[in-house]
């Protein structure tokens, strides 16, 4: 038994036929010693007398609000809730399995940007006697603060014969660092109480993995002279992180009729305009995704083709984002070739995802603690890799990126990746390895040597352990190169001489 909140206790029960249950001793919160009686819920039947009451809790009939009285006066209450465990698994009767992105997904969370603000939601078919409370933190062993509001009923839907209720909650990390590479996941804990049943649900994620931008805004069409083509332009959504030269999006533009089966024109672009072929009765749709990290695509923003009247061209805000404040010289050399670094770091992002695209769909934290990759270097808040830090002095950040590149380059060339099980011959790990080396050489000024971080001895003996470690390293590398790519994109746009 444990205390959920003041005067509310949860009794954990192994739930099987003829289970012995749990013996619980309740103590009346009073200085009185004599003449105390106990009742349960609305019943006037006296269950026992004295300052303590010992009960055997086996089923829901034994749970409820126990009240101690003296001479018709209520002294205190203790509400007992039951938490069922069947075959070693805690019950999940209250919430509905959303089955996306995998089975046993009860809580789903999304963030519109990197500000540390996110929304979680869950579904239930229960309409009454239901309460939720939500707690969250960054990390669990030394938790950092995340503040969550109250869970509210956000939608009701009819599904067949049943009504489905959606609840949601908004949370905000207390001291978020949008530009940093997350090393500890956000933990979300939801306590659910239905009548006398208690259940708890948890979710663990990095903000980067739950990013889903809002749709692009202000779609405009401009027909091109003497052509079937139309120039479509749009802008970054207002809710997306700024500056856009750092937090860049990529876009998918599609022209399609009302039916998904109809023919279509489709093009991907990093710009905020594109030229497509419009057809009568078709619509042009645009959606957005983080340019450097493969999180979710936004919903589509759409405009009908027939509306392609004379409106202005694209003035999207994905451009440079400011003047060209010059980079302070790195000791032993000049500023890096920002544009070359940008191109190579973007290539690294692509390679890191193609090296293991499905890594994102594996919950690797099930196989170990949250610090599975705490040995790898992370770009942290104080490393100066945010837009302001880069403007002040990019040297600190570039040194950190260089250290990370060397570290990962050595890891990819180590026994972890060269040992059994052999990598598939078509694995892009080789290209990734070469590109890491290429970028680190581009970054290392001539005749100057930054100190590099010691590679930990991470050589597991079992092939399955090696496989798991590869996944974790690649997953971590995806996050690292995304931050590096943002740094170089921003540098190329704002710091290049």
């Amino acid at each position: 038994i444990w205390e959920l909140k003041k005067d509310v206790y949860v009794v954990e029960l192994d739930w099987y036929p003829d289970a012995p249950g749990e013996m619980v001793v309740l103590t009346c919160d009073t200085p009185e010693e004599d003449g105390i009686t106990w009742t349960l819920d609305q019943s006037s039947e006296v269950l026992g007398s004295g300052k303590t009451l010992t009960i055997q809790v086996k089923e829901f009939g034994d749970a409820g609000q126990y009240t101690c009285h003296k001479g018709g006066e209520v002294l205190s209450h203790s509400l007992l809730l039951l938490h069922k465990k069947e075959d070693g698994i805690w019950s999940t009767d209250i919430l509905k399995d959303q089955k996306e992105p995998k089975n046993k997904t009860f809580l789903r969370c999304e963030a519109k940007n990197y500000s540390g603000r996110f929304t979680c939601w869950w579904l239930t078919t229960i309409s009454t006697d239901l309460t939720f409370s939500v707690k969250s933190s960054r990390g669990s062993s030394d938790p950092q603060g995340v503040t969550c509001g109250a869970a509210t009923l956000s939608a009701e839907r009819v599904r067949g014969d049943n009504k489905e209720y959606e609840y949601s909650v908004e949370c905000q990390e207390d001291s978020a660092c949008p530009a940093a590479e997350e090393s500890l996941p956000i933990e979300v804990m939801v306590d659910a109480v239905h009548k006398l049943k208690y259940e708890n649900y948890t979710s663990s994620f990095f903000i980067r993995d739950i990013i889903k931008p809002d749709p692009p805004k202000n779609l405009q069409l401009k027909p091109l002279k003497n052509s079937r083509q139309v120039e479509v332009s749009w802008e970054y959504p207002d809710t997306w992180s700024t500056p856009h030269s750092y937090f860049s999006l990529t876009f998918c533009v599609q022209v399609q009729g009302k039916s998904k089966a109809e023919k279509k024109d489709r093009v991907f672009t990093d710009k905020t305009s594109a030229t497509v072929i419009c057809r009568k009765n078709a619509s042009i749709s645009v959606r957005a995704q983080d340019r450097y990290y493969s999180s979710s695509w936004s919903e589509w923003a759409s405009v009908p083709c027939s509306g392609s009247g004379s409106s202005r061209g694209g003035s999207g805000s994905g451009g440079s984002g400011g003047g060209g404040s010059k980079l302070r010289a790195v000791p032993g050399g000049s500023s890096p070739a920002w544009t070359q670094c940008q191109q190579l770091s973007q290539k690294l992002c692509t390679l890191a995802w193609s090296a293991h695209p499905l890594v994102g769909h594996m919950d690797l934290r099930e196989e170990g603690d949250e610090e599975t990759t705490n040995d790898v270097p992370h770009i942290q808040c104080g490393d100066g890799c945010d837009p302001q830090g880069l403007r002040d002095n990019s040297q600190f950040c570039l040194q950190r990126i260089h250290q990370g590149l060397i570290f990962y380059e050595k890891l990819l060339g180590s026994d972890i990746f060269t040992g059994e099980p052999s990598l598939l011959p078509d694995s892009p790990v080789g290209q990734l390895h070469a590109s890491l080396l290429g970028l680190s050489q581009l970054l290392q000024p001539e005749g100057h040597h930054w100190e590099t971080q010691q590679i930990p001895s991470l050589s597991p003996s079992q092939p399955w352990q090696r496989l798991l470690l590869r996944f974790k390293i690649l997953r971590s590398l995806q996050a690292f190169v995304a931050v590096a790519a943002r740094v170089f994109a921003h540098g190329a746009a704002t710091l290049s001489p």
């Epitope: 022209v255 024109d265 093009v267 991907f268 672009t269 009568k280």
Partner: antibody
């Protein structure tokens, strides 16, 4: 399954015109875009243009603008590509291809060899 | 127009070995890049679309990667039926253009 069957080989004199046909089957003709791509002997692929059989809309590569006409006959599910003012360097295999996506080529015809020779 | 450059022009590989084909665009084309295989006397066939998306019915040994200006087609373990010419094609803007092709031949 989706299939494209093209007309037979042609031999033409310089300055003449050629009209190659491409009969589609296995799908609703107006549901796919139709492209024409050519390949000179021992050379690479060259895109000529596309037509939307639903409305007759066309887009031609600048190189062929004014010299090529693409048409369709929805009653027979057939597409046509006419190339005028033929020159010897128009000697090539001409392919029609179809796709629901406009910008790449999924289903190809078997090709029609057009030889331009005096 | 966007110029597509493929390298090498010819690649000599032994059966069972891995082949890596490159395609470079004259300007950034995001992931608007597709790969085709053509055997002598046959029409080309689509292998990969939008840089890395696989086609049903195409063996898993064919994979694509890249974005921007540099793209790669990898054939993990060459089979006898894979010796052919491979073309890349950009769909970023009209006119649609192809690379000059890479001939993969038996070493």
């Amino acid at each position: 399954q989706v299939q494209l069957v093209q007309s037979g080989a042609e031999v033409k004199k310089p300055g003449a015109s050629v009209k190659v046909s491409c009969k589609a089957s296995g799908y609703t003709f107006t549901d796919y875009y139709l492209h024409w791509v050519r390949q000179a002997p021992g050379q690479g692929l060259e895109w000529m243009g596309w037509i939307d059989p639903e409305n007759g809309d066309t887009e031609y590569a600048p190189k062929f603008q004014g010299r090529v006409t693409m048409t369709t006959d929805t009653s027979t599910s057939t597409a046509y590509m006419e190339l005028r003012s033929l020159r010897s360097d128009d000697t090539a295999v001409y392919y029609c291809n179809a796709n629901k996506e406009l910008r790449y080529f999924d289903v190809w015809g078997q090709g029609t060899m057009v030889t331009v020779s005096s | 127009e966007i110029v597509m450059t493929q390298s090498p022009a010819t690649l000599s590989v032994s059966p069972g070995e891995r082949a890596t084909l490159s395609c470079r665009a004259s300007q950034s084309i995001s992931i608007n890049l597709h790969w085709y295989q053509q055997k002598p006397g046959q029409a080309p066939r689509l292998l990969i679309y939008f840089a890395s998306q696989s086609i049903s019915g195409i063996p898993a040994r064919f994979s694509g990667s890249g974005s921007g200006t540099e793209f790669t087609l990898t054939i993990s373990s060459l089979q006898s039926e894979d010796f052919a010419v491979y073309y890349c094609q950009q769909s970023n803007s009209f006119p649609l253009t192809f690379g000059g092709g890479t001939k993969v031949e038996i070493k």
